[in-house]
Interface confidence: low
């Protein structure tokens, strides 16, 4: 007998063909011999089965000897062997209906787990293979688990259910709630305005929640809350902000913070958290601020950086258009009795300049 796989909620068409290409008597019955539908004269008649309000046939194809049965809004319990009786012969079709659903909300925080559950008819032994938008393949039986969702898991998951060499494909849209970046570093000269941006890696029609930026300054012994805010339908409103520094916050997404000026005492690391309404857990993004200062005091020219720098970074003092250079993998460099001219302080990573500050040394007469 023929096997047909269907998806819960979908429509399926079971075909039945007569040898004569003409309109003739036919009946569809279930395995209990209860009539579902058939033809009486020129009219479609329906029997007392549970399918009567969801079963139909393509009348336009009857003249061609095609007597299909269409079942709408499929249910798992529609799985059965259906018998088509036409021209004194019986055709059997086994229909197996499957459903695949996410156990929880399909909007999940990064790091949370996703479980997909397969609903299947008794006696079936299907296998499931799912492919994430990022190309990750996961196999399973009745359940498929993804223990820790990542940003790249956002999008349409394609799951193939296989049974008796037949397959049916499900598409499930998963949204991973996360910031676009896990971490970012801003490099600024002392006194410059600092812009922090926290773009989200998803879009939701209604986005409501609350957030906070905690800051651990390099010079401070403990962290402190710099700002707390609310998010209502993508509109941002500040709840509380420290007096020093007095941050400003944009009213629209993406979340945007402005520090009026970069100062050594602000250099350090921050953690922006965002708690979304009706979600357990929080979104996190780390942000780092590195501040540079170049100064001349008496006979000493000094360049310093504050904030989280990697040991690989190089700090250099260089006299413009001259070979004079001092470089160190350290947070401060200095030159005693510097030559007159324009000096550059450079913070670089493998030759790539991250931050630059110029200071003019005037000749001492």
């Amino acid at each position: 007998k023929k096997v047909v796989l269907g998806k819960k909620g979908d429509t399926v068409e079971l075909t039945c063909n007569a040898s004569q290409k003409k309109n003739t008597q036919f009946h569809w019955k279930n395995s209990n011999q209860i009539k579902i539908l058939g033809i009486q004269g020129l009219f479609l008649t329906k029997g007392p089965s549970k399918l009567s309000d969801r079963a139909d046939s393509r009348k336009s194809l009857w003249d061609q000897g095609c007597f299909s049965m269409i079942i709408k809004n499929l249910k798992i319990e529609d799985s059965d062997t259906y018998i088509c009786e036409v021209e004194n012969k019986k055709e059997e079709v086994e229909l197996l209906v499957f459903g695949l659903t996410a156990n929880s909300d399909t909007h999940l925080l990064e790091g949370q787990s996703l479980t997909l559950t397969l609903e299947s008819p008794p006696g079936s032994s299907p296998s499931v293979k799912c492919r994430s938008p990022g190309g990750k393949n996961i196999q399973g039986g009745r359940t498929i688990s993804v223990p820790q969702l990542e940003r790249q898991d956002s999008g349409t998951w394609t799951c193939t259910v296989s049974q008796d060499q037949k397959t049916v494909e499900f598409k499930i849209d998963i949204v991973v709630l996360a910031f676009q970046k896990a971490s970012s570093t801003v490099y600024k000269k002392e006194g410059e305005q600092v812009e922090f941006s926290f773009p989200l890696a998803f879009t939701l029609e209604k986005l409501t929640g609350s957030g906070e930026l905690w800051w651990q300054a390099e010079r401070a012994s403990s962290s402190k809350s710099w700002i707390t805010f609310d998010l209502k339908n993508k509109e941002v409103s500040v709840k509380r902000v420290t007096q020093d520094p007095k941050l400003q916050m944009g009213k629209k997404l993406p979340l945007h913070l402005t520090l009026p000026q970069a100062l050594p005492q602000y250099a350090g690391s921050g953690n922006l958290t965002l708690a979304l309404e009706a979600k357990t857990g929080k979104l996190h993004q780390e942000v780092n601020l590195v501040v540079m200062r170049a100064t001349q005091f008496q006979e000493n020219l000094t360049c310093e950086v504050w904030g989280p720098t990697s040991p690989k970074l190089t700090l250099s003092l260089k006299l413009e258009n001259k070979g004079a250079t001092v470089s160190k993998q350290a947070k401060a460099v200095w030159v005693l009795n510097p030559e007159a001219g324009m000096w550059q302080c450079l913070l670089s990573d493998s030759g790539q300049v991250l931050l630059e500050s110029n200071i003019k040394v005037v000749p001492t007469w």
């Epitope: 190309g135 999008g155 990573d349 493998s350 030759g351």
Partner: antibody, heavy 120, light 107 residues
């Protein structure tokens, strides 16, 4: 200066092998996904493969799966494409490119390309 | 795989003209689309990322818009150096897919 330089292209017979290299400089190579993109003579661009920062994930276009292998050596700031069982339709200029930091951020740095000709 | 349909395949325009090139995805891709310019014998150059963000160093006459399935690149006032081939690129999931390209020629 941020730079990518490809090498290793040349003339090879159908069924032969070739290994392309891409030397990166001027940026933290180990912090970026990297891609190979090719362009057949007179044709458009085709993405071939890419590799995660630490090499733990690799993706390929269907037409090269099982024949091409993308790899990287972060200590040498180098990206590679091992091409086996080469076919005439693999004839193209091959570019290495730096992937943006996350989805939707494009390929922001490209090499000048290296030419691969597969012909008997 | 998601298909990208880019149009037109070629376009003739004059210096100072405003031109628009479009790309349509066979299914929704959020805003994960970039636009590239390529001149003969040269490597492609990223102009627009994330559908509408201008890449650093790219002139402001280039702009991108769209999300979901329909995207467009507009050059507000063509300059002589803008005559080239333009490609859209979907990097939402694998395989990454380029549009067929649009050749922009001097009328």
């Amino acid at each position: 200066e941020v730079q990518l330089v490809e090498s290793g292209g040349g003339l090879v017979q159908p069924g032969g092998s070739l290994r392309l290299s891409c030397a990166a400089s001027g940026f933290t190579f180990s912090s970026y996904w990297m891609s190979w993109v090719r362009q057949a003579p007179g044709k458009g661009l085709e993405w071939v493969a890419n590799i995660k920062e630490d090499g733990s994930e690799k993706y390929y276009v269907d037409s090269v799966k099982g024949r091409f292998t993308i790899s990287r050596d972060n200590a040498k700031n180098s990206l590679y494409l091992q091409m086996n069982s080469l076919r005439a339709e693999d004839t193209a200029v091959y570019y290495c490119a730096r992937d943006g930091s996350y989805s939707g951020y494009g390929m922001d740095v490209w090499g000048q390309g290296t030419t691969v000709t597969v012909s008997s | 795989a998601i298909q990208m349909t880019q149009s037109p395949s070629s376009l003739s325009a004059s210096v100072g003209d405003r031109v628009t090139i479009t790309c349509r995805a066979s299914q929704g891709i959020r805003n994960d689309l970039g636009w590239y310019q390529q001149k003969p014998g040269k490597a492609p150059k990223l102009l627009i990322y994330a559908a509408s963000s201008l890449q650093s160093g790219v002139p402001s006459r280039f702009s991108g818009r769209g999300s979901g399935t329909d995207f467009a690149l507009t050059i507000s006032s063509l300059q002589p150096e803008d005559f080239a081939t333009y490609y859209c690129l979907l990097d939402y999931n694998y395989p990454y897919t380029f549009g067929q390209g649009t050749r922009l020629e001097i009328k």
